[in-house]
Interface confidence: low
């Protein structure tokens, strides 16, 4: 046995470009030749343990075989010289590891980026994977000053190991090397402070003015190299439950500065904030965003008054009238504040009046049958808003006016009103509503409108399948209009239950069917019509229709002597229900009639 | 075997003038780029011409324009640089390179892998 290898293969470290040819050839020593009685006929080439076809393989001479590939695509294979010696025992001569893949692309895209505090970060796009060792080496180099290579772990980006010397041109650029090519990228030439990210602002804080309800100011520290920058910033706000952030013009906040002023906002809302900054020249990267930090505008008077009506409840007496005055918490974008209590005041007719303050949104108050005027303001700690004025005119003036052509519909989700306005001038309208049952009173809620709205929805929470009786009131200088209601439904259903049908007279050929009307609380919609089904025991069914207005129906053509069966169905909009069943018997004979 | 042979350099008075010329062989000339670089002792190394030696693109440092000029004559493989108007500031050892990693004229030395062992030029008043 030989303790030297009996040939080597050439190259010993091939390394192939993807999609190529390859030739490697396995020279035989001498010694070898003489040893095993062999020549360069007797090798064999192999990859990965499999014997080449012999049309790859070429002896050049005695000592001498190469092997040749083509189109070669595996990323690495293990290539074998091999021997009969003796011309029938396999030796293995020599073996390398055949790599492929692709010389390195010119990187491209190459930026880099100063993290304050840190050193200089270089990125770039390697291009198509070379699937070799690839070495990519970030350069870098002043006009007199050669700059310590940066070998990347990644093939993606480095970190110099130098601190950026801020205010001198450097000129970058990546080299890209493997067994089977090296590039270089375009360089790039800059100054590392034009590439700077600042650290973000902090400190952030917020403060309301007591003078002005409409802005907040803030403060804030930058870095910006410890002072070696001027830095502008970029200023953000969002209400505390809007998930949309509000940018503050950037021509505001261009010159360098640590505070700022945000104006326009709207009293007594919590803001959030937050702020980033960046070289004043616009050159480099803005910072991240700063911690966010949360004010509070000062509160404002009220901006507009609580809708405002009354309703008046039966009297017992003659001379006075409980009537109760009723009014709806403002929003909080028109309360501007806590709002602390309502000021009411009574007058009646031009004569002394009467001032209520209460915290609550109701006041009941004994009036005599003359007219009054009430007025209403609500108070925050900054002051009131303006007042509503309600005419309450005598119980002995009959209502003149109202509104015509009210409609209600459903329509994505909403129960819509809709009228047209009486031919004099309107101060408000109030619409009012509530569910009708019979098991329960009609609960009424309410809302008020402006003079110039003939079309609005209800903005309480409506259910499905009940029926809302809505009426709209119109409000003049003089006191209420007259009132105008219909039924709705913000949406149908079939009905609960069908009628319960029984007869009224049953002669020998007809019988006059009764019913009631289903009650409202089971209708879940309106009753559009009916549907009579009736049959004997054998025959086939008949079906009639009839309109909801009915309440009984007369069957004709019976058969005498002959059970019969009879079930109703109700329909809405949205489906029917049937009824119980119910039989009866028609007679043999008619009245007076005899066999 | 790549080699670059300089030659042409010597000794001047302000304002004369001299021809370099840089004969390159053992690689394709069509796909390389060559420049001109010199060195004072004490100083770092500064570029002061390149040549797309396929496009004939040419680049200079800001302070020899309008004075040098780069040329070739690729039958010949050898690139030229014309010195005019030569300045005391000129003096130094001259040095051709050559790339073919790179894909756009430039003089950061960086960039260049091959390099003659230089020429000096001596400008004197």
């Known amino acids: 046995q030989l303790l030297e290898p009996c040939g080597y293969i050439y190259p010993e470290f091939p390394v192939v470009q993807r999609g190529s040819n390859f030739t490697a050839i396995c020279v035989l020593k001498e010694a070898c030749l003489q040893h095993y009685y062999v020549n360069a006929s007797y090798i064999v080439w192999k990859t990965n343990h499999a014997a080449v076809p012999r049309e790859q393989v070429t002896v050049i001479n005695r000592t001498t075989s190469s092997v040749t590939f083509t189109d070669v695509v595996l990323p690495s294979v293990q290539l074998t010289c091999n021997i009969l010696s003796f011309g029938q025992i396999e030796q293995n001569v020599y073996g390398v590891t055949m790599l492929s893949g692709f010389p390195p692309d010119k990187p491209t895209n190459l930026t880099c980026i100063v993290n304050e505090g840190k050193n200089m970060l270089c990125q770039w796009d390697p291009g198509r994977e070379t699937y070799l060792e690839t070495n990519y080496t970030l350069k870098s180099e002043w006009a007199t000053e050669k700059f310590p290579d940066c070998q990347s772990k990644h093939g993606t980006s480095c970190m110099v190991s130098y601190m950026p010397t801020y205010y001198v041109n450097i000129e970058v650029w990546v080299e890209a090397e493997n067994a089977l090519g090296k590039v270089s990228s375009e360089s790039i030439n800059f100054d590392p402070v034009d590439k700077v990210k600042p650290t973000p602002p902090y400190n952030l804080s917020v403060t309301n003015s007591e003078e002005l309800s409409s802005i907040l100011k803030l403060s804030w520290v930058s870095s910006g190299l410890g002072g070696l920058l001027d830095l502008k910033s970029d200023i953000q706000y969002r209400t505390k439950d809007a998930s949309t952030w509000i940018q503050v013009p950037l021509e505001d906040t261009m010159s360098p500065r640590t505070s700022f002023t945000v104006q326009d906002l709207k009293p007594f809302t919590e803001y959030v904030f937050r702020i980033r900054s960046i070289k004043d020249s616009g050159k480099g990267y803005w910072s991240d965003w700063s911690e966010e930090a949360s004010g509070t505008t000062y509160e404002d008077r009220p901006s507009r008054p609580p809708s405002f009506w009354y309703k008046t409840n039966p009297s017992h007496g003659q001379e006075y009238r409980s009537v109760r005055l009723i009014w709806k918490a403002l929003p909080l974008s028109e309360a501007n504040g806590k709002i602390l209590d309502y000021e009411v005041i009574l007058t009646q007719s031009k004569s002394v009046s009467q001032t209520y303050t209460v915290t609550g949104t109701e006041l009941t108050v004994n009036l005599t049958n003359d007219r009054y005027v009430a007025s209403l303001a609500a108070r925050n700690k900054v002051g009131k808003s303006a007042a509503a004025v309600l005419t309450i005119p005598s119980p002995h003036v009959t209502a003149a006016y109202s509104v015509v052509n009210l409609k209600a519909f459903p329509k994505d989700n909403l129960l819509w009103v809709e009228w047209t306005p009486p031919p004099k001038p309107v101060s408000k309208y109030i619409l009012e509503w509530c569910v009708l049952s019979e098991n329960a009173p009609c609960v009424e809620d309410w809302q008020q409108e402006d003079a110039t709205v003939n079309r609005t929805h209800l903005r309480g929470r409506l259910l499905e399948s009940k029926c809302y009786q809505i009426t709209v009131t119109p409000v003049f200088a003089t006191g209420p209009g007259g009132s105008e209601s219909l039924k709705a439904y913000l949406k149908q259903a079939a009905p609960a239950r069908g009628p319960t049908v029984r007869t009224k007279k049953v002669g020998k050929n007809e019988a006059v069917l009764a019913w009631d009307q289903i009650p409202v609380d089971d209708q879940n919609g309106f009753i559009r019509n009916y549907s009579i089904s009736y049959r004997t025991s054998v025959g086939k069914e008949m079906v009639v229709h009839v309109d909801s207005s009915h309440t009984e129906y007369t069957l004709s053509s019976l058969s005498s002597d002959t059970l019969y069966m009879v079930r109703m169905a109700a329909y809405t909009d949205e489906g029917g229900k049937d009824g119980p069943e119910f039989t009866f018997t028609t007679p043999k004979f008619a009245q007076g009639e005899i066999e | 075997q790549v080699q670059l042979q300089e030659s042409g350099g010597g000794s001047v008075q302000a304002g004369g003038s001299l021809r370099l010329s840089c004969v390159i062989s053992g690689f394709t000339y069509k796909q390389t780029f060559m420049g001109w670089f010199r060195q004072v002792p004490g100083k770092e190394r500064e570029g002061v011409a390149a040549?797309?030696?396929?496009?004939?693109?040419?680049v200079y440092a800001d302070s020899v324009k309008g004075r040098f000029t780069i040329s070739q004559d690729s039958s010949k493989n050898t690139v030229y640089l014309e010195m005019n108007g030569l300045k005391l500031e000129d003096t130094g050892m001259y040095y051709c390179?050559?790339?073919?990693?790179?894909?756009?004229?430039?003089?950061?030395?960086?960039?260049?892998?091959?390099w003659g062992q230089g020429t000096q030029v001596t400008v004197s008043s």
């Open positions: 040549i797309s030696t396929g496009g004939g693109n040419t």
């Open positions: 390179a050559a790339s073919t990693v790179i894909t756009s004229v430039t003089v950061n030395r960086g960039l260049y892998q091959y």
